[in-house]
């Protein structure tokens, strides 16, 4: 039960995190105009990874895409790449984790396969979260160190740079969304990895089973007579039911004729 809950919660947390990473990547407010010196501007500037926008007092908002690749700062390109890698890994991780969920039965999938898939998706979520956090942090660092400049200024006119009054930018909402989303994805990934440990079939010391041969009162241990007892081939991945209470997670579920009603 605990493993299922951990896995399910990890999946949900990662799902929310990846949705947040996608939202942050698409948002325009990665950097917003610093209003400290001019709180009553009639023109408010904000910028995203893909376009820069201007919201006027009139209510009109104008956005211009960055229609260049070579003209953009390398750091911005790096942030874009990190966020996209994070989204792609997260999306693949989600796909894998859906099939790995203990509550979902797909054919005769072994628990070991589910455990491996859970671990794989967990690692993907961790890397995805780290990519997002790294991307957002790189961008934040660009802002803090004043390397971030209005992209529109970088390729106006005849390739020259307009060095007029530079608008100062501060952290936008997308940065906080990205940090939180990356953190959630990371936490979700860790939870999936923890769940994987609980899902993995244990190579345990199996309890002895009394086997009464005809006419003799001799106890045999499983594996001794593989050909005649049939235990050797079958018990390796099974716990022998001894009548004791078991949690849902302790009893490994295998397909039976009742599973496909």
């Amino acid at each position: 039960m605990a493993v299922t809950a951990c896995q399910g919660l990890g999946f949900v947390v990662s799902l929310i995190g990846i949705a947040g990473i996608i939202a942050a990547t698409c948002m325009d407010q990665w950097s917003t105009q610093d209003l400290y010196n001019n709180p009553v501007t009639a023109v408010f500037n904000y910028q995203g990874l893909w376009r820069s926008c201007v919201r006027e007092s009139s209510g009109f908002t104008e956005c211009r895409g960055y229609f260049t690749l070579l003209g953009l700062p390398a750091m911005l390109q790096a942030v874009r790449a990190l966020m996209i890698v994070g989204i792609v890994l997260g999306a693949i991780g989600l796909l894998v984790s859906i099939f790995a969920l203990k509550c979902i039965r797909i054919g005769s999938m072994e628990d070991s396969a589910k455990a491996n898939m859970t671990l794989t998706s967990g690692i993907m979520f961790i890397v995805s979260g780290l990519c997002a956090i790294a991307g957002v942090s790189v961008f934040a660092n660009m802002l803090v160190t004043n390397f971030w400049m209005s992209t529109a200024n970088m390729y106006t006119g005849m390739g020259g740079m307009v060095q007029t009054v530079q608008t100062r930018y501060t952290f936008g909402a997308a940065l906080f969304v990205g940090w939180v989303a990356g953190g959630l994805t990371l936490i979700g990934g860790v939870m999936m990895c923890i769940a994987c440990r609980g899902l993995a079939p244990e190579e345990t010391n199996y309890k002895a089973v009394s086997y009464h041969a005809s006419g003799h009162s001799v106890a045999y241990k499983p594996g001794g007579f593989k050909a005649s007892t049939g235990f050797g081939s079958n018990t390796k991945n099974k716990k022998i039911y001894d009548g004791g209470a078991r949690t849902e997670d302790e009893v490994q579920s295998y397909p039976s004729k009742h599973d496909y009603v």
Partner: antibody
């Protein structure tokens, strides 16, 4: 046709109050940012206050801050300017103006104005 | 506050001649975010409210004759009437549309010589 009609002007004593109204028609009033601009007897134009479409943001000239309040009733397509603690220097012709959506914050339509005289 | 300084205070030009009005702002009206200058020009005839002629420093408002041209960048702007007509006699104002308060110039009175 866009029309802005101001009303509520008149003669008022210093320290008195007055409420100006601006009835708008011919456009979707709630979409537009609206302003009050006054013209002094010396013919100088002075922006007084602005309110954005939804009414969430308001901006005022420092000299009228705390005395004047700009508001709007989008259901009635009406802009208001509540003026308290009036002074002699508030004497002017008050215009209601619309901020054009794509006109870089410029005022594209103006009313005919309503005259306010503050005198004892 | 941004101070808008217009020159000259008054101007007398012959019909058909070019009229030039200047406007200088104490701070830049250029916005780097969209590469636009936030300056407007208005025309006011006696007994009438101001009428928008030019916005964004150089864009003519619809219905404004093409003899009216706005130019300039940052802090220095110009309104040019290429061939003065009798109906152009008015007072012309420039306005800062970039930062509150939205200040106006003192106006330039244009007359026929």
């Amino acid at each position: 046709e866009v029309q802005l009609v101001e009303s509520g002007g008149g003669l008022v004593k210093p320290g008195g109050s007055l409420r100006l109204s601006c009835a708008a028609s011919g456009f979707t009033f709630s979409t537009y940012t609206m302003s009050w601009v006054r013209q002094t007897p010396e013919k100088r134009l002075e922006w007084v206050a602005t309110i954005v479409g939804g009414g969430g943001y308001t901006y005022y000239l420092d000299s009228v801050k705390g005395r004047f309040t700009i508001s709007r009733d989008n259901a009635k397509n009406t802009l208001y300017l509540q003026m308290n603690s009036l002074r002699a220097e508030d004497t002017a012709l008050y215009y209601c103006a619309r901020m054009g959506l794509t006109q870089r914050n410029a005022l594209d339509y103006w009313g005919q104005g309503t005259l306010i005289t503050v005198s004892s | 506050d941004i101070v808008m300084t217009q020159s000259p205070d008054s101007l007398a030009v012959s019909l058909g001649e070019r009229a030039t009005i200047n406007c200088k702002s104490s701070q830049s009206l250029f916005n780097s975010g969209n590469q636009k200058n936030y300056l407007a020009w208005y025309q006011q005839k006696p007994g009438q409210p101001p009428k928008l002629l030019i916005y964004g420093a150089s864009t003519r408002e619809s219905g404004v004759p093409d003899r009216f041209t706005g130019s300039g960048f940052g802090t220095d702007f110009t309104l040019t009437i290429s061939s003065l007509q009798a109906e152009d006699v008015a007072v012309y104002y420039c306005q800062n549309d970039h930062t509150y308060p939205l200040t106006f110039g003192a106006g330039t009175k244009l007359e026929i010589k």
